[in-house]
Interface confidence: medium
């Protein structure tokens, strides 16, 4: 288990260029919303400090038919060394709390920014 400032990420640490691309994709999603993202779909909130890319992917795997986050899902799967099935990381859900996809994406974005600021990926 590779731990980056509390952001547990099973497998090799993604190169900073790939993470930059992920951040920019999350930026695009958060900034270009003309309507509720994924029709307001709800996903499990996760503990981003304890969880990692696989956990984030696990939560987003429950969302289907939302083209806006398909690229994010693909990028996250590239950071996760094994196939993720929905509900695999239920123990890392935050008190069984569900939030909108838009909030989930923004939370993930801010967490990655924080890790970059702290020099975890530089």
């Amino acid at each position: 288990l590779t731990c980056l400032g509390g952001f547990a990420s099973p497998g090799p640490v993604p190169p900073s260029t790939a993470l930059r691309e992920l951040i920019e994709e999350l930026v695009n999603i958060t900034q270009n919303q003309k309507a509720p993202l994924c029709n307001g779909s709800m996903v499990w909130s996760i503990n981003l400090t304890a969880g990692g890319f696989c956990v984030a992917l696990d939560s987003l795997t429950n969302v289907s038919g939302c083209s806006a986050i398909e690229k994010t899902q693909r990028m996250l799967s590239g950071f996760c060394p094994h196939k993720v099935s929905a509900g695999q990381f239920s123990s890392l859900h935050v008190r069984d709390t569900k939030i909108e996809v838009a909030q989930f994406v923004k939370d993930l974005l801010l967490h990655l920014k924080k890790l970059f600021r702290e020099g975890q990926f530089n």
Epitope: Q31, L109, F116, R117
Partner: antibody, heavy 122, light 108 residues
Amino acid sequence: EVQLLESGGGLVQPGGSLRLSCAASGFTFSSYAMSWVRQAPGKGLEWVSAISGSGGSTYYADSVKGRFTISRDNSKNTLYLQMNSLRAEDTAVYYCAKADFWSGTLWGFDYWGQGTLVTVSS
Amino acid sequence: SYVLTQPPSVSVAPGQTARITCGGNNIGNKIVHWYQQKPGQAPVLVVYDDSDRPSGIPERFSGSNSGNTATLTISRVEAGDEADYYCQVWDSSSDHVVFGGGTKLTVL
């Protein structure tokens, strides 16, 4: 310790030109976007311009576009603002500010210089 | 272009809680930063990324952001907190940095 020191302000006639400089130290200058923010006497903060760490991307407020040019010399750790066709409404204290991240959408400004006063008057 | 609306002034007694709002269309989708500026001084970042505090900023300063309103909360207000406060976001539609008009906090 991060330090930003502006210079180049002064009194100039309408239609005149001025070049502001901001000498930076205490951080890896080329890794961060930089910005100019101004404040007219007794007024609020107004963003003027920003430039990416590499200098490849520049951004301008509508009020200065076509008149002001932002640039940087990473070998000298210095930020510049070339101001042409100055107007009375450009009178303000001009602050140099360091962005806290490389992606524009996420920019906050974590360090500011003390400012340099530009007065445009005949 | 994107507009951020702040109340011109907020007054609070020492020891009480001050709440300064920053309104904007779907601002909850954006990332908000807050600055404190005392007379004759440069602005200081007090809250970034909606709710994070830079080192050196007291825990009394906190931020939240959802819907159409971002809020800077200052608990147990002290006389030294008297200043102008500005919110700021990036507007991706124009590629501009946007500041709110500022709020003058008066400690009674």
